[in-house]
Interface confidence: medium
């Protein structure tokens, strides 16, 4: 069964900077990746970035840079302009679509105890959208 993993990390050098890493574990090629925060895409979440393997990427503030790390994983850099660091308690979700097989989504957040610069362990919470 395909699986999506999500890691959220705070940058050690800049406490206002966060990076979300997501990956797809499974067969098939990725046709679209959507990163959202506050919940799953289409279920209360707000889009942060959309990455298409051939048509490029689009991102919305506070996302700073979305990029492919491998053919099946992406990273999204976030710039937290506020002093209260709302990202620390936010859920980030990544949805990987593989046409026509379906799409799979998982969510993750920065662990409360995580030190700056340490990445959260990959703890996928699969939300199966389709097969």
């Amino acid at each position: 069964t395909p699986e999506v993993w999500v890691q959220v990390q705070m940058e050690a050098t800049e406490l206002s900077s966060f990076t979300v890493h997501c990956g797809f574990l499974g067969p098939g090629s990725i046709s679209l990746v959507t990163v959202s925060w506050g919940g799953p895409d289409g279920a209360g979440g707000t889009k942060l970035a959309v990455l298409h393997p051939e048509l490029g990427t689009r991102q919305w503030a506070p996302a700073r840079q979305a990029r492919w790390e491998t053919q099946s994983s992406i990273s999204l850099a976030l710039e937290d302009s506020g002093a209260s660091s709302p990202f620390a308690n936010t859920t980030f979700c990544c949805k990987f679509a593989s046409f026509p097989e379906g799409s799979w989504e998982s969510c993750g957040s920065l662990p409360p105890s995580s030190d700056p610069g340490l990445s959260a362990p990959p703890t996928p919470v699969p939300i199966l959208r389709a097969d």
């Epitope: 046709s31 959309v50 298409h52 051939e54 048509l55 679509a97 799409s103 389709a130």
Partner: nanobody, 118 residues
Amino acid sequence: QVQLVESGGGLVQAGGSLRLSCAASETYFDLYVMGWYRQAPGKDRELVATITYTGSIKIVDSVKDRFTISRGDAKNTVSLQMSSLKPEDTAVYFCNADPSGLGRKVYWGQGTQVTVSS
């Protein structure tokens, strides 16, 4: 298999408005591009407007100031708002979906008739 179901066509007087809607039966994945084409009697099918998953819009010049395209809150739905209609807008309007955005596999609706009388 993606099925596209159009609605909203009909007969309208010149200068009037219509809103066409299209919904995809398959919502397991995000359709990257959705759009509308039209085919007038005896003519080839032509592009009217498209909108991508990220909100990029393309509308042909001949209708740019009169038609608007939008995607609904429900994913994989698309609407075409047509105003100041002219008799030359009379055609069968087809909903189109391109899941990859690259034209590798394209789906069509069955079409909805729009007739503009003078």
